[in-house]
């Protein structure tokens, strides 16, 4: 009965050639989709001459599919029983699936003269980089195509720098073509508790972003966990688009196509600040626009973006501190659409569908130097778009799990 | 006291060039942005060109036609101005400046070194 | 390009007069605002810097006041020692520029 189960499960989950899970794992038979909802802004001007608050609209859905591309360089190392791969990234446009085309036009903040501005304090170089700003012709805000924004342009304004600087921007470029990774993980057989768990990432065991345990990276990628999955566990994984390791926690049963599965999500605790949860200490990495490390439900990545104000958050800025978005105008955050979740089969610890959801923000700062920036009186942590990342077990995949998996145990 | 001691300076003909030097007495020039500022005979100030702390930013007025070139040697605390195809409206004081601490620009200045340009 | 227009040209002030030089901007530069005197024979001091900011060790005789475009810089004694050319400096944005100059004089 239950230890031949076990023995079964053992042996399937191992990620090594000619096992269910490894079938699985180096091409998932999921489809994959991210949804954009892009932030279009309202009111650049007034934002920009009386630094009124920022009027934001959501628009979207606009679907890609993603992940669909199969693991490369796929190296098993019995020595200490890991198998190394890369995640290729690629992104097909959907667009039965979205409400307009890749052409569809949005006011962002112009991303090239935010970063600028922050990466280069100096005023010496602020007036030299404002030269160039007014030469090119562009300003706080900016008009640009879901394409442009999402996959990258030429700025105008960066390609006159005289200086040996990338002149593509874009919130994912570069992407297509591109790969995460090196991931090393525990393939689980010496030990299945450890099936999945990352060893190493871009060969070291820590990010180098954070202080203290903050850097470590921790659990899986979040595609499965080690089997025999338990209501009290806290669900540790890595996910390289926050730049951090993050943890779910049991919220509730779910009944997923005739398949029992766990539900974890992502707790507010998790996003909290220091003061509420003083384990986040090592997430606060400045003090003066988290007020002293006071704020939260916002994630300085700077650090890992080559010195971009980039901020991650929830959609809508769920979980966050008043002042946060008391400068945003627009924004409804609401749990159910916002949160992020798991849905875990327990036994296998395959993670059968998931809604991974998290935003973009941009960090733009008043700079008497920088004439499109001056007349700002106040920071501004500007939502650019929102993701959700959504995944299901096929009906087919259901049916076999149910027959193989479940309907054994029951 | 910051000190900053220009040399390199003197009489040319149109078309040569010149290089000229300021060797810095402080311990930070690394840390500072600095600059290169002329005086003309009839009394004007002008912003000859500037660099930023590591030398990876430099900045020329479009009407110095890119004939000077700003550098610095961080290691020899010492600024330099390569002057090429040197013209007579080109004679003037040339004074090395250190900015200041928050951004100021010219907060320091040298003695000056002349350089004259006479057919 | 800000043009900065400096007058008077020169001037001729008794000591304990008070001094007035004024700079005007072609466009808003805030108080970016920068004042050098220059001695004969010295280098350029930067006596006032922007935001009216009196640098260290300046006498408190000195100051400057002015916003957007009109800028005005006072010594409210003169003294015998304060005979120099006077310039403005505007630092709000590239090309750099300075007033023609101020040569002011005993009487």
């Known amino acids: 009965g239950d230890m031949l189960i076990q023995k079964t499960i053992k042996k399937e989950v191992v990620l090594e050639e000619g096992t269910i899970a490894f079938k699985n794992w180096v091409k998932t038979g999921t489809e994959i989709y991210r949804q954009f909802w892009i932030f279009d802004v309202q009111n650049p001007q007034e934002v920009m001459m009386n630094s009124s608050n920022i009027q934001v609209k959501q628009r979207g859905p606009y679907t890609y599919r993603v992940r669909f591309l199969a693991k490369e360089n796929i190296t098993q190392d019995p020595k200490d029983n890991t198998v190394s791969f890369l995640q290729p990234n690629g992104a097909i446009f959907e667009p039965s699936l979205s409400v307009g085309t890749e052409a569809d036009n949005f006011t962002v903040l112009n991303l090239a003269v935010a970063a600028a501005s922050h990466i280069y304090p100096n005023p010496f170089v602020q007036v030299v980089l404002n030269s160039l700003i007014n030469k090119s012709k562009s300003s706080m805000f900016q008009v640009r195509t879901l394409r442009e924004l999402l996959w990258g342009y030429t700025d105008p304004f960066l390609s006159l720098v005289p200086y040996p600087v990338s002149t593509r921007v874009g919130m994912f470029y570069p992407y297509n073509n591109t790969a995460d990774g090196v991931y090393k993980v525990f393939n689980g057989k010496d030990s299945i508790s450890k099936v999945a768990i990352i060893d190493t990432y871009k060969g070291k065991r820590n990010l180098s972003y954070w202080e203290s345990y903050c850097d470590m990276i921790n659990g899986t990628d979040a595609a499965s966990f080690p089997p025999f999955v338990e209501k009290s566990q806290v669900l540790q994984f890595f996910s390289s688009d926050i730049c951090r390791s993050i943890y779910a926690v049991f919220e509730s049963d779910v009944n997923l196509k005739g398949i029992p599965v766990y539900r974890f999500v992502l707790p507010s605790k998790a996003f909290a600040s220091p003061v509420q949860n003083p384990d986040n200490h090592c997430f606060c990495t400045e003090k003066i626009i988290s007020k002293n490390c006071t704020s939260y439900g916002v994630l300085d990545i700077s650090k890992c973006k080559e010195g971009k104000p980039v901020y991650i958050s929830l959609p809508h800025f769920l979980y966050a501190s008043p002042d946060v978005s008391e400068t945003i105008d627009g924004l409804n955050p609401n749990e159910e659409e916002h949160r992020t979740y798991l849905d875990i089969e327990p036994i296998t610890g395959f993670t059968l569908q998931f809604a991974k959801r998290l935003q973009v923000n941009l960090l733009v700062k008043p700079s008497n130097k920088i004439q499109v920036l001056k007349r700002l009186k106040r920071n501004y942590i500007v939502p650019i778009l929102w993701l959700n990342e959504t995944g299901t077990i096929g009906d087919e995949k259901a049916k076999m799990f149910r027959s193989q998996v479940t309907g054994k145990i029951n | 006291e910051v000190q900053l001691v220009e040399s390199g300076g003197g009489v040319v003909q149109p078309g040569e060039s010149l290089k000229l030097s300021c060797e810095s007495n402080?311990?930070?020039?690394?840390?500072?942005?600095m600059s290169w500022v002329r005086k003309t005979p009839e009394r004007r100030l002008e912003l000859v060109a500037a660099?930023?702390?590591?030398?990876?930013?430099?900045y020329y007025p479009d009407t110095m036609e890119r004939r000077f070139i700003i550098s610095r040697d961080n290691t020899k605390k010492t600024l330099y101005l390569q002057m090429s195809s040197l013209k007579s409206e080109d004679t003037a004081m040339y004074y090395c400046?250190?900015?200041?601490?928050?951004?100021?620009?010219?907060?320091?200045w040298g003695q000056g070194t002349l350089v004259t340009v006479s057919a | 390009e800000t043009t900065v227009t400096q007058s008077p040209a020169s001037l001729s002030m008794a000591i304990g007069e008070k001094v007035t030089i004024r700079c005007i901007t072609s466009?808003?530069?805030?108080?970016?605002m920068n004042w050098y005197q220059q001695k004969p024979g010295e280098p350029p001091k930067l006596l006032i810097s922007?935001?009216?900011t009196l640098r260290p060790g300046v006498p408190s005789r000195f100051s400057s006041s002015g916003y957007g475009t009109d800028f005005v810089f006072t010594i409210e004694n003169m003294l015998s020692e304060d005979v120099a050319d006077y310039y403005c400096?505007?630092?709000?944005?590239?090309?750099?520029?300075f007033g023609a100059g101020t040569k002011l004089e005993l009487k």
């Open positions: 400046a250190r900015h200041g601490q928050t951004g100021t620009w010219f907060a320091y």
């Open positions: 402080e311990y930070e020039f690394p840390s500072h942005d």
């Open positions: 660099i930023n702390s590591d030398g990876a930013i430099t």
């Open positions: 466009t808003d530069i805030d108080d970016d």
């Open positions: 922007e935001g009216n």
């Open positions: 400096l505007q630092s709000d944005n590239l090309p750099l520029t």
